[in-house]
């Protein structure tokens, strides 16, 4: 039993972690600067998307890049519990705090703000430079989706790295996982064409959920053959003229649930991965 | 002046490097096994490409993946001159060999075989599983292209890493370069749509040349609107019914030079990067 409550311990761990973050601002500022620069570069490359076949390719390309970038950037989250492993064991054994207080304290003060910022920055810069769907709900759905991808990828990093002493193995494992997840995200291969004995792997792909949600959000209702007269040559039948046609060819459900089920899946993955990370910390102290 | 000729020194360095390679086969065998497994996975995912709109997406996707994989795999080449830096300086000062003998010896015995193997393995496995263009010349052009990409990426790695003492900085720099090169390769963004003040960057992108060559090789003469005569005059700007239409939309020159200029560009990059690497080794010994 502890003399202090869970909430008091949580506040204490959060406060200390946040102070460490502010006391060593180089890393945080560097991350923000890199994100801003990358956002501006992406914005410049894709500036002012067209409503034609290149518009389809460029929309899909930029959404894929943003999704996979969120994943690979989250690899750095492996450090969260690794670098302080000895300190955690020492302080836990000394009775400073519960595992749960330390776990949620670190998440609240470190993971939550540092994974939220890039999503906000990217969306704010990229959205208007590219001229994505000009509605408030589409803007915030994109921001929320990128956050969910970042959180689920970071949670996976924690689940793999928690309790380990070296970062390198976890980083390598994460990178390999993300490469395979990237293949199954839906840009490099049309997911409807994969053999059934392999296609189930797509349901374990974090970028697949993020990319699907971003595409559903952006493509629905778009016209990619604007002004195409109904009297023209028949070869236009092979064109992808609407966002719905594109989404259907990608095997994406057009209903509202077709959007939100991706966020539900990401939320489930976050819960599962964080539970694994927590249990690993719990078992770590038992064997320390 | 040296008592032994350049050729003798070259043979000696090559022989020793090759012996080291055979004496520590784990790394080489591991690389081959990983390449075979990845080749089989890619083959299974993309098995039997269709001749419809999904066939366009899947062909482009797999060619993009193979190109970027060759690039990112080549990051490991940074180690070639870094891990033996102290030994090289010691042996050079002791008059064992010329810088040129060491440089070309290492390239011949280490870089040449270890970068050639993945290209051969990937092509042999993937080509037939996917059902790519069933002609011998297309098969060997693909193999040659993947080799050229691997060599130019490895040469870039050497140019960046030569003379350095730690691998990590060079690896990070390489990775960042390849991420930007990947954006400009032509899948994630239609290169014809990039603003002129930015589009010149594509000419510095290794995967862009590889990807363009692979697409030119695979798409030319393909029909993606089954049941529609491919020779019919297509007045629709939105449909992609032939490989030629697809390549034109990507801004790819359909002439034979449109294929080979990519290999010429990669060859030029190899020469430039290897020259930089050689000069860095040359200056290294002056300051040691």
């Amino acid at each position: 039993s502890y003399t202090t409550s869970f909430c008091h311990q949580l506040r204490w761990v959060s406060k200390r972690s946040f102070k460490n973050l502010l006391g060593n601002p180089q890393a945080s500022i560097a991350q923000i600067i890199v994100t801003v620069i990358l956002g501006l570069v992406i914005g410049a490359i894709y500036f002012g998307l067209n409503n034609d076949s290149t518009g389809i390719q460029n929309r899909a390309g930029v959404l894929f890049f943003l999704t996979t970038n969120q994943c690979f950037s989250s690899v750095s989250a492996v450090e969260l519990f690794v670098v302080e492993k000895k300190l955690f064991i020492h302080e836990y054994i000394s009775g400073y705090y519960r595992v749960s207080s330390y776990f949620f304290g670190k998440l609240l003060s470190d993971l939550l703000p540092m994974r939220m910022l890039p999503s906000i920055i990217f969306t704010c810069i990229v959205y208007f430079m590219l001229g994505l769907k000009p509605t408030a709900d589409a803007f915030f759905i994109m921001m929320f989706t990128l956050m969910m991808v970042a959180y689920s990828a970071s949670s996976m990093a924690l689940a793999i790295a928690a309790g380990q002493s070296v970062v390198s193995v976890a980083t390598l494992l994460m990178t390999i996982c993300f490469v395979f997840m990237m293949i199954f995200s839906g840009l490099l291969v049309n997911l409807t064409t994969i053999a059934s004995w392999l296609s189930w792997l797509q349901y374990f792909s974090i970028p697949r959920y993020g990319f699907t949600a971003l595409q559903h959000n952006e493509f629905l209702g778009q016209n990619f053959c604007p002004g195409l007269n109904a009297t023209v040559n028949n070869t236009c039948n092979y064109a992808t003229c609407t966002g719905e046609e594109y989404l259907t060819k990608q095997g994406i459900d057009l209903s509202p649930w077709g959007l939100w089920k991706n966020h539900v899946a990401l939320a489930c993955m976050i819960v599962i991965f964080l539970t694994i990370a927590y249990l690993k910390l719990l078992f770590l102290k038992k064997y320390s | 002046s040296y008592t032994t000729s350049f050729c003798h020194q070259l043979r000696w360095v090559s022989k020793r490097s090759f012996k080291n390679l055979l004496g520590n086969p784990q790394a080489s065998i591991a690389q081959i096994i990983v390449t075979v497994i990845l080749g089989l996975v890619i083959g299974a995912i993309y098995f039997g490409l269709n001749n419809d709109s999904t066939g366009i997406q899947n062909r482009a996707g797999v060619l993009f993946f193979l190109t970027t994989n060759q690039c990112f795999s080549s990051v490991s080449a940074v180690e070639l001159f870094v891990v033996e830096k102290k030994l090289f300086i010691h042996e050079y000062i002791s008059g064992y060999y010329r810088v040129s003998s060491y440089f070309f010896g290492k390239l011949l015995s280490d870089l040449l075989p270890m970068r050639m193997l993945p290209s051969i393995i990937f092509t042999c496995i993937v080509y037939f599983m996917l059902g790519l263009k069933p002609t011998a010349d297309a098969f060997f052009i693909m193999m040659f292209t993947l080799m050229m990409v691997a060599y130019s990426a490895s040469s870039m790695a050497l140019a960046i890493a030569a003379g350095q003492s730690v691998v990590s900085v060079a690896t990070l720099l390489m990775t960042i370069c390849f991420v930007f090169m990947m954006i400009f390769s032509g899948l994630l963004v239609n290169l014809t749509t990039i603003a002129s003040w930015l589009s010149w960057l594509q000419y510095f992108s290794i995967p862009r040349y590889g990807f363009t060559a692979l697409q030119h090789n695979e798409f030319l003469g393909q029909n993606f609107c089954p049941g529609l005569n491919a020779t019919v005059n297509n007045t629709c700007n939105y449909a992609t019914c032939t490989g030629e239409e697809y390549l034109t939309k990507q801004g790819i020159d359909l002439s034979p030079w449109g294929l080979w200029k990519n290999h010429v560009a990669l060859a030029c990059m190899i020469v430039i990067f290897l020259t930089i690497a050689y000069l860095k080794l040359l200056f290294l010994k002056k300051y040691s």
Epitope: N223, P226, G227, L228, N229, A230, N234, C236, A239, E245 | -
Partner: antibody, heavy 118, light 106 residues
Framework: EVKLLESGPGLVKPSQSLSLTCSVT?????????WSWIRKFPGNKMEWMGY???????NYNPSLRSRISISRDTSKNQFFLQLNSVTTEDTATYYC???????????WGQGTLVTVSS | DIVMTQSPSLLSASVGDRVTLSCKAG??????LAWYQQKLGEAPKLLIY???SLQTGIPSRFSGSGSGTDFTLTISSLQPEDVATYFC????????FGSGTKLEIK
């Protein structure tokens, strides 16, 4: 010359299904284009309802997706509209038209008035 | 959905007059706008597409202009057969129609 003609009952009871047929002449519906349904309410408000493509793929207005179905009979060169659980709000003149994607409608039928009333 | 607002809802003009009909979009629709003419008891007829392109077989007295959110249909010299209701349609995002302008002769 492409011609489209709508047919179906002029009166439908609330909560029942509205079913209309569009017969196409001068063009085979499987050869190309998207075959649409549009309706014009009393008071001139017009609404695109959905279409069935030459390949049989359907695309519906999101506001109607839960109760609309468009199908076809290729042997008769006809396509159909079914709207379930109708209310008096569905009283309108229903048109069929030829289009490609979300674009201007170059060919229209004459329209058929459907009244929903008990 | 993008809301299309047409004004006026009723317009009276004399034969030979230059008539201007307005259509406003709730958001930027580039130039993805079409104009239709519908006479009583008839199907709508496409007049203009892409804001300013005249459909084949339509008299040259009809012209369209505008881009972004504000569009106009102009009849340079009103004829008796032009009495009809005129609709605009946007096709930038899904497709929606304006509520129409009824044109009559004084």
């Amino acid at each position: 010359e492409v011609k489209l003609l709508e047919s179906g009952p002029g009166l439908v009871k609330p909560s029942q299904s509205l079913s209309l047929t569009c017969s196409v002449t001068g063009y085979t519906i499987t050869s190309g284009y998207d075959w649409s349904w549009i309706r014009k309410f009393p008071g001139n408000k017009m609404e695109w309802m959905g279409y069935i493509s030459y390949s049989g793929w359907t695309n519906y207005n999101p506001s109607l997706r839960s109760r609309i179905s468009i199908s076809r009979d290729t042997s008769k060169n006809q396509f159909f509209l079914q709207l379930n659980s109708v209310t008096t709000e569905d009283t309108a003149t229903y048109y069929c038209a030829r289009v490609r994607g979300y674009n201007p409608f170059a060919y229209w039928g004459q329209g058929t008035l459907v009244t929903v009333s008990s | 959905d993008i809301v299309m607002t047409q004004s006026p809802s009723l317009l009276s003009a004399s034969v030979g007059d230059r008539v201007t009909l307005s259509c406003k979009a709730g958001q930027n629709i580039n130039n993805y706008l079409a104009w239709y003419q519908q006479k009583l008891g008839e199907a709508p007829k496409l007049l203009i597409y892409n804001a300013n392109s005249l459909q084949t077989g339509i008299p040259s007295r009809f012209s369209g202009s505008g881009s972004g959110t504000d569009f106009t249909l102009t009849i340079s010299s009103l004829q008796p057969e032009d009495v009809a209701t005129y609709f605009c349609q946007q096709y930038n995002s899904w497709t929606t129609f304006g509520s129409g302008t009824k044109l009559e002769i004084k």
